[in-house]
Amino acid sequence: KKVVLGKKGDTVELTCTASQKKSIQFHWKNSNQIKILGNQGSFLTKGPSKLNDRADSRRSLWDQGNFPLIIKNLKIEDSDTYICEVEDQKEEVQLLVFGLTANSDTHLLQGQSLTLTLESPPGSSPSVQCRSPRGKNIQGGKTLSVSQLELQDSGTWTCTVLQNQKKVEFKIDIVVLAFQKASSIVYKKEGEQVEFSFPLAFTVEKLTGSGELWWQAERASSSKSWITFDLKNKEVSVKRVTQDPKLQMGKKLPLHLTLPQALPQYAGSGNLTLALEAKTGKLHQEVNLVVMRATQLQKNLTCEVWGPTSPKLMLSLKLENKEAKVSKREKAVWVLNPEAGMWQCLLSDSGQVLLESNIKVLPTWSTPVQP
């Protein structure tokens, strides 16, 4: 008996071939001997089976002695043995229909779990193997679970169902809802405008939800909400914003915030959360602001940084085109009685400059100039 695997919702074509290459009488029946379809001369006739409106044949193959049974919009319960009667012969085909669905929505938040459930006909014992977009293989029986979804799990999951040495392949598109970056650092000189961007790692037709940026300034004892906003069909509208600082927000995606001035009191880290409509949980992106200030007071040239810097960052003061006068893994460095000239304050990581501020030291009879 020939075994054919089908997919729920799909179309299957069961073949039946006569030895004569011409159009002759044929009938397809199910295991209960109920007629599904056949021919009467040149015409297709249908029986009283439950497949009536979903069963068809392909007339263009009849004159070659091929009499297929086509079943559209397959259901699990279409799994059965189908019998083709032609030329006093009976050809049996066993059809097994499987379905594979994601238990929840196929749009899942980063960190959530994905469960795939296999629907199969009674008496079958299939095995399932799924391959994620990043090449990770998972195996299982009726259900497969993947916990802690990551951004790289977004894309097409290919699942193969094996039964009777035959296989059928399912493709399920999974979208992991997350920001492109888990965290980012912005380095700015005091007084500069600061741009924070929060690009999403997915695109959907309509995006609705609400969000908030909480900020923990380094100098503050507690965090505070800097801005709250709504998102409706990818349009951003501000609900509430603090007076200090007075953030501005772009009206379109990607989410974009502007801080008019980088000041030491704003240096710190923030957490932008986005709650999407009809989703439990929130998307998070951490953002950090490091602010640099170079000053000269009397005979002391000082360079300071505020905000979350890593211990391996180096802060240096150097006269232009000369070796660093002072270089420390600290958040403040200074030079007493600096020579006249253009001094540079540099924040660097393994030789790569992250932030630079210049200050001109004039001869001792004049006051310093900050460009």
Partner: antibody, heavy 118, light 107 residues
């Protein structure tokens, strides 16, 4: 979102053969028959033949019998149509089309121009 | 082979017009008839199958009728994008055959 993507244009000499491919993407390829239809420049549509989903059943129009061969490779979701003993009147755009159960063609390839010229 | 004769072979009409194209089979083909639309340089597009069933995604201004030997494609109110060539196709017997086409042009 099934799509049929055909191979590129061909220029052949009379007497030669041409093999046009039709690759399916985005759906279950093995569930559908594929028909081939051609259209000579400025002319109407002409059915050439059909290959069933498993590839073990074909029917060619009498006009092309003996010159046309249709095959399918399920591993690559590709159907091929080979036409031999080409003549100038075989110059046409060749289309593959998904043949649904009542032999209506609901999805078509973009067409492959075959020019036969000495 | 079953011959399919379409009329008219060309037709001029204006946006908003009601247009009818006919197709005659050389023998009884039941309802085994399909209609296609083709634009220059493009593949044909299925509009109607089984004589009167509207293909998914096709605007409802297109309709098909008839059985036996005489069939009609009607466009109730022509839109600018409807100017194209229309073909009927019989699937009653092999070889499957198409009508010669009706070119619908802007008046």
């Amino acid at each position: 979102q099934v799509q049929l993507v055909q191979s590129g244009a061909e220029v052949k000499k009379p007497g030669a053969s041409v093999k046009v491919s039709c690759k399916a993407s985005g759906g279950t390829f093995s569930s559908y028959a594929i028909s081939w239809v051609r259209q000579a420049p400025g002319q109407g549509l002409e059915w050439m033949g059909i290959i069933n989903p498993s590839g073990d059943g074909t029917n060619y129009a009498q006009k092309f019998q003996g010159r046309v061969t249709m095959t399918r490779d399920t591993s690559t979701s590709t159907v091929y149509m080979e036409l031999s003993s080409l003549r100038s009147e075989d110059t046409a755009v060749y289309y593959c089309a998904r043949d649904i159960s009542n032999d209506a063609f609901d999805i078509w390839g973009q067409g492959t121009m075959v020019t036969v010229s000495s | 082979d079953i011959q399919m004769t379409q009329s008219p072979s060309s037709l001029s009409a204006s946006v908003g017009d009601r247009v009818t194209i006919t197709c005659q089979a050389s023998q009884d083909i039941g309802n085994y008839l399909n209609w296609y639309q083709q634009k220059p340089g493009k593949a044909p597009k299925l509009l109607i199958y089984a004589a009167s069933s509207l293909q998914s995604g096709v605007p409802s201004r297109f309709s098909g009728s008839g059985s036996g030997t005489d069939f009609t494609l009607t466009i109730s109110s022509l839109q600018p994008e409807d100017f194209a060539t229309y073909y009927c196709q019989q699937t009653y017997n092999t070889p499957l055959t198409f009508g010669g086409g009706t070119k619908l042009e802007i008046k």
